[in-house]
């Protein structure tokens, strides 16, 4: 720890002091530098400020002091391991007061109302006051008048000048003042009184359609005299006609783009094709936006979205009925569909394509398919701009013909009936099969009802004339081949109940 004693402090002048200290122990790592710090117990107690660093082979230095500071010094030795313990503090040296040597910086003038100007600045740090207190001499006059300056001395770091005209430029000076005098002659800053809303209406030059979902909007620069403030930029607002939200008739979703003041065009993208848009362009300043120039434009047609819900329905082992819904997003006037398909095992070769030139079409029958192949079907809706995104389905008649495994088949019973129901697989070829109910139990003697002919796509079958409280086996046959078996028991005797609504009976 370097020793620093009172006798080592020599006040050379009112603004210079010589500080000396004895070398610190280096602990086998040479001292690289000494840091001389000061504290002002009156203005910033327990806050130490560095006055400078000197090489490690020096044991004294001369320091420049500021007026009216209560200096208490200390010295810290620094080696490669870092700073050591600081020295004991010196006694306090108070420098005499003096006029300010600096003026405030960051002087600004701008209105927060239409008829005022608020002058602000960054206040001096206490170490630049040069006296117990500092004030500020604020001067202002309209720019270019060469007339007398108006002035006011204030303690706060701002001054509100009232009753100004709207957005007038002012010359502004702010000078530090204390009991010993004034600071140096300040620089002139240009400020402005309060802004008003712009009166300028941007004049649209035109709208260039870039594609079905983007436009370029251009306008002429506004007359700055009508901006009534600093032109900050342009607000571009646009919305689609008829874009009211479902749940709020009054609310229209509007999109906004802010364009910098030096730019007079903007590309609006992400628009919906084949739609009418409203557009507004407003100049804005610090106060707000001015009147809007209004315009309407329409985006051209684009390609449509993909058709909805493409289903394959087996007609025979060589034909399929394709059934679909139109796209949700037309993006224009639908003109029809394009259907393409190819066998899956031929790697995209042998692609066939049909133009379906009727936008009202919802079905198309494909014939001459191979019963042994699976196909990839691709359906696109078209507008005059061409085909859109495809909906794709894979299938064929082979997997869909023959009897299904009757997934999700179930049977329920009342007292004298039973309902057999199943979920037909999508695209499954319709076929006919037999359902046979066979009563079980000794006294029933295994009596069978006559087999009934049922269509697969009817989803359910109701068998009447069953005995109450009886176990039945249900047999499903196709072309004399046993396909499925299940069991059901009718309810005990009592009032006959009808089957649930919606079930087909035969």
């Amino acid at each position: 720890v370097p020793r620093l004693v009172l006798s080592d402090l020599h006040l050379l002048t009112q603004s210079q002091v010589r500080v000396s200290w004895s070398p610190a122990e280096d602990h086998n790592a040479p001292i690289e530098k000494y840091d001389i710090e000061f504290e002002d117990k009156e203005m910033a107690p327990e806050k130490w400020y560095s006055l400078g660093k000197v090489p490690g082979n020096q044991t004294s230095t001369t320091l420049k002091l500021s007026p009216y500071v209560h200096y208490t010094f200390r010295v810290t030795a620094i080696n490669k391991y870092g700073p050591g313990e600081p020295s004991p503090v010196s006694e306090t040296v108070v420098t005499p007061e003096a006029a300010p040597e600096k003026n405030p910086v960051d002087v600004k003038g701008e209105g927060n109302e239409t008829t005022n100007m608020v002058i602000t600045w960054k206040p001096l740090r206490w170490m630049d006051w040069n006296a117990p207190q500092v004030q500020y001499r604020v001067q202002w006059r309209p720019q270019g008048t060469r007339g007398p300056w108006q002035e006011q001395i204030v303690s706060d770091p701002f001054l509100v000048v009232s009753n100004t005209s709207t957005f007038v430029p002012y010359e502004i000076k702010v000078q530090a003042v204390n009991s010993q005098g004034k600071g140096p002659e300040p620089q002139v800053t240009i400020g402005y009184s309060g802004e008003d809303y712009p009166q300028a209406i941007p004049e649209l030059e035109g709208i260039e359609i870039l594609n079905s979902s983007a436009v370029l909007v251009k306008w002429r620069p506004v007359d700055l005299a009508q901006v009534k403030g600093h032109l900050r930029g342009y607000n571009v607002t646009y919305w689609r006609e008829g874009s009211q939200r479902k749940h709020s008739k009054r609310h229209i979703h509007k999109d906004h783009v802010v364009v910098p003041a030096n730019t007079t065009s903007v590309i609006l993208s992400g628009l919906r094709p084949y739609s009418s848009y409203h557009l507004e362009v407003q100049a804005f300043n610090g106060r707000g936006s001015g009147p809007a120039s209004e315009f309407t434009f329409s985006t051209p047609e684009g390609v449509p979205g993909h058709p909805e819900a493409l289903h394959l329905e087996c007609q025979s082992n060589t034909s399929l009925l394709l059934r679909w819904q139109p796209p949700l997003s037309h993006n224009g006037v639908l003109t029809g569909y394009v259907l393409s398909y190819h066998p899956l095992d031929e790697g995209g070769k042998g692609q066939l394509s049909f133009n379906l030139r009727d936008p009202e079409l919802r079905t198309h029958n494909l014939t001459d398919l191979s019963p042994h192949l699976r196909y990839r079907f691709q359906l696109q809706a078209t507008t005059k701009e061409g085909p859109g995104e495809a909906i794709v389905r894979e299938g064929g008649t082979m997997a869909l013909s023959g009897i299904s495994d009757f997934g999700n088949i179930s049977a329920t019973a009342g007292e004298n009936y039973s309902v057999v129901s199943w979920v037909p697989k999508e695209g499954q070829c319709n076929f006919r099969f037999h359902i046979l109910f066979k009563a079980l139990g000794e006294e029933k003697g295994g009596a069978s009802l006559s087999p009934q002919y049922v269509s697969y796509n009817q989803s359910s079958y109701t068998q009447w004339d069953l005995q109450p409280d009886t176990d039945y086996e249900i047999h499903l046959f196709k072309e004399r081949m046993f396909r499925h078996q299940m069991a059901v028991k009718t309810n005990g005797t009592g009032r006959v109940r009808l089957p649930p609504a919606g079930f087909a009976t035969e």
């Epitope: 003109t335 394009v338 692609q351 394509s353 133009n355 009727d358 078209t382 005059k384």
Partner: antibody, heavy 120, light 106 residues
Framework: EVQLVQSGAEVKKPGASVKVSCKAS????????MHWVRQAPGQGLEWMGD????????SYNEKFKDRVTMTTDTSTSTAYMELRSLRSDDTAVYYC?????????????WGQGTTVTVSS | DIQMTQSPSSLSASVGDRVTITCSAS?????MFWYQQKPGKAPKPLIY???NLASGVPSRFSGSGSGTDFTLTISSLQPEDFATYYC?????????FGGGTKVEIK
């Protein structure tokens, strides 16, 4: 420049066949469906059928389906229309016409026409 | 097949006249197509999908209509417009053409 150039005029006897060619240039031949339309003297236009040069798929007007065959040769970008069992009322100008961009469905480019005269 | 009936079958008009040709389909169609044909020449497309101008067609031509009734309008007849005009539908195969409307010089 997109062009369809057809073969020259033909004079045929009743019962004979005629094969009219249509050579395409200035575009990708396989990307557009080719149609055949005929026009009897002083009459209107009548669609005969079309062919997709990409895979040779055809669609014929029921009126002609037993007598007409449409083919293409992609190596020469040429479409052909053959009409068999000619009758005197087959005397007409036969046009090939390209179907425009998908979704527009109109005949955007036509050949100059081939006059076929059927006379004994 | 859908039958197309054009009217009038012929008309006489002067340069500068507004000319309207109508086409009626025997059943509802989605779109109408219009072609212009001059003597000894192949037809030339004018209007597709009811109201869209084919490439290079002057803006004095316009098309409108829906369902079974469609119209071709020439706002100001020019000397080069004297020709025969055909409508065509394509709801389903076969596409069928109207009998034509001959526009002659008065």
């Amino acid at each position: 420049e997109v062009q369809l150039v057809q073969s020259g005029a033909e004079v045929k006897k009743p019962g004979a066949s005629v094969k009219v060619s249509c050579k395409a240039s200035g575009y990708t031949f396989t990307s557009y469906t080719m149609h055949w339309v005929r026009q009897a003297p002083g009459q209107g236009l009548e669609w005969m059928g079309d062919i997709n040069p990409n895979y040779g798929g055809t669609s014929y007007n029921e009126k002609f389906k037993d007598r007409v065959t449409m083919t293409t040769d992609t190596s020469t970008s040429t479409a052909y229309m053959e009409l068999r069992s000619l009758r005197s009322d087959d005397t007409a100008v036969y046009y090939c016409a390209r179907e425009g961009a998908t979704g527009t469905w109109y005949f955007d480019v036509w050949g100059q026409g081939t006059t076929v005269t059927v006379s004994s | 097949d859908i039958q197309m009936t054009q009217s009038p079958s012929s008309l006489s008009a002067s340069v500068g006249d507004r000319v309207t040709i109508t086409c009626s389909a025997s059943s509802s169609v989605s779109f109408m197509f219009w072609y212009q044909q001059k003597p000894g020449k192949a037809p030339k497309p004018l209007i597709y999908l009811t109201s869209n101008l084919a490439s290079g067609v002057p803006s004095r031509f316009s098309g409108s209509g829906s369902g079974t009734d469609f119209t071709l309008t020439i706002s100001s007849l020019q000397p080069e417009d004297f020709a025969t005009y055909y409508c065509q539908q394509w709801r389903s195969n076969p596409p069928t053409f109207g009998g034509g409307t001959k526009v002659e010089i008065k």
